[in-house]
Interface confidence: low
């Protein structure tokens, strides 16, 4: 069963899965330039047995422009920032993760990709947060979120993280409201 | 059951010293931040201040600052509010509430009425 | 630090709608989305009914409803009853780290 929303937004942080539950899926998204190939499919899916889990698919970006070619378009140096961030990020978590049965691993970067992940989790997938970099973790307690289906509806449960800026330690943290989503909270992770 | 119980209804004097609690259960106490709110008599909600119990971090409205310590011991999952002098214009019902992660206040406890009279 | 200015007071009869205004500043309501607005019945500590403008806690009624503009958000309760009778306050994050609340406004239901 898929989870009906994304998990928690906490101000000035970021969550990652150690491993993804079999049925998740993840978008096969493409930079900007690109766009997924004809016959490729619109997504990768965890699948396996007792034994193996792995990504059903695999996502192919090709370039968008007239002419058919394999030259990648330059990124703009925003764009090459995070997506250095994204490439660090997936280095990262395949570094400490360990084989879950019934977890699929994160997916290695494809050519291409764009620089958010965007994943749609199933209950029982549990999320960890991090405040990024130059903030710190006020709350020392369960920094995660877990999709749990209650009462035939499924919700996240809320992480206990306040990240707050290491420059101004006597402050709690906040972002300005985005005028144009009054109702979330700032957008700040990298994967959904 | 997530709830905060503060402790019972105190009659004071002027100058004297005190103390009251409150006490998280029900969820991982060390993990919220817990406000302290005044509410004088007929009048409205005034915040105090707030503190982790995890480790005492602590930050004050500037209205009570110097004027209240706010103070936890997280091995007993409560948070404190103390006066070392009190005045008659202290009396009011003061009310504990845990921050959630909305910086909403979401679970209060059943206030502490405080009476300062000569 | 200021309150929020709300009205004293509001009343409507059964069935009707209110909204009660808050008025705060750039430096709290109008900076953050973490407005939140809580119900006190008499004698009885607050509950927090809205969070992050116009969120509900489970649990509360889907007649409850928030929204903000500006330096200004507002309560909207809906299709009002008898056992709505009760203090409303609004709340803010502010700017300085620290909450503030408004001054309160009593909503009488009309018999």
């Known amino acids: 069963e898929l989870c009906d929303d994304d998990p928690p937004k906490i101000t000035h942080a970021t969550f990652k899965a150690v491993a993804y539950k079999e049925g998740t899926m993840l978008n096969c998204e493409c930079k900007r330039g690109f766009r997924r190939i004809k016959s490729g499919s619109p997504y990768m899916l965890c699948t396996g047995n007792s034994s193996h889990s792995s990504w059903d698919n695999q996502c192919q970006c090709t370039s968008s422009a007239a002419r058919n070619t394999t030259k990648q378009v330059t990124p703009q140096p925003e764009e090459q920032k995070e997506r250095k961030t994204t490439e660090m990020q997936s280095q990262m978590q395949l570094a400490d993760q360990v084989s879950l049965p019934g977890h699929c691993r994160e997916p290695p970067p494809w050519e291409n990709e764009a620089t958010e992940r965007i994943y749609h989790f199933v209950v029982g997938q549990t999320v960890y947060y991090q405040c990024v970099q130059g903030y710190r973790a006020l709350h020392r307690g369960p920094a995660e979120s877990v999709c749990k289906m209650t009462h035939g509806k499924t919700r996240w449960t809320q992480p206990q993280l306040i990240c707050t800026g290491e420059t101004e330690p006597s402050q709690f943290p906040g972002e300005e409201e985005p005028q144009a989503s009054p109702d979330g909270l700032p957008e700040s992770e990298t994967s959904r | 059951q997530v709830q905060l119980v503060q402790s019972g209804a105190e009659v004071k004097k002027p100058g004297e010293s005190l103390k009251i609690s409150c006490k998280g259960s029900?969820?991982?106490?060390?993990?919220?931040?817990i406000g302290w709110v005044r509410q004088m008599p007929g009048k409205g909600l005034e915040w105090m201040g707030i503190?982790?119990?995890?480790?005492?971090?602590?930050r004050y409205s500037p209205s009570f600052q110097g004027q209240v310590t706010i103070s936890a011991d997280k091995s007993i999952s409560t948070a404190y509010l103390q006066w070392s002098s009190l005045k008659a214009s202290d009396t009011a019902m003061y009310y504990c509430?845990?921050?959630?992660?909305?910086?909403?206040?979401?679970?209060w406890g059943r206030g502490t009425m405080v009476t300062v009279s000569s | 630090q200021s309150a929020l200015t709300q009205p004293a007071s509001v009343s409507a009869s059964p069935g009707q709608s209110i909204t009660i205004s808050c008025t705060g500043t750039?430096?709290?309501?109008?900076?953050?989305?973490?407005v939140s607005w809580y119900q006190q019945l008499s004698g009885k500590p607050p509950k927090l009914i809205l969070y992050?403008?116009?969120k509900r806690p489970s649990g509360i009624s889907d007649r409850f409803s928030g929204s903000k503009s500006g330096n200004t958000a507002s309560l909207t309760i809906s299709g009002l009853q008898a056992d709505d009778e009760a203090d409303y306050y609004c709340?803010?994050?502010?700017?300085?780290?620290?909450?503030?609340f408004g001054g309160g406004t009593q909503l009488t239901v009309l018999g």
């Open positions: 503190i982790y119990p995890g480790d005492s971090d602590t």
């Open positions: 992050d403008v116009s």
């Open positions: 029900g969820y991982s106490s060390t993990s919220y931040w």
């Open positions: 709340s803010s994050y502010t700017r300085s780290s620290t909450w503030v």
């Open positions: 750039s430096s709290d309501v109008g900076a953050y989305i973490y």
């Open positions: 509430a845990r921050l959630g992660s909305a910086y909403a206040f979401d679970i």
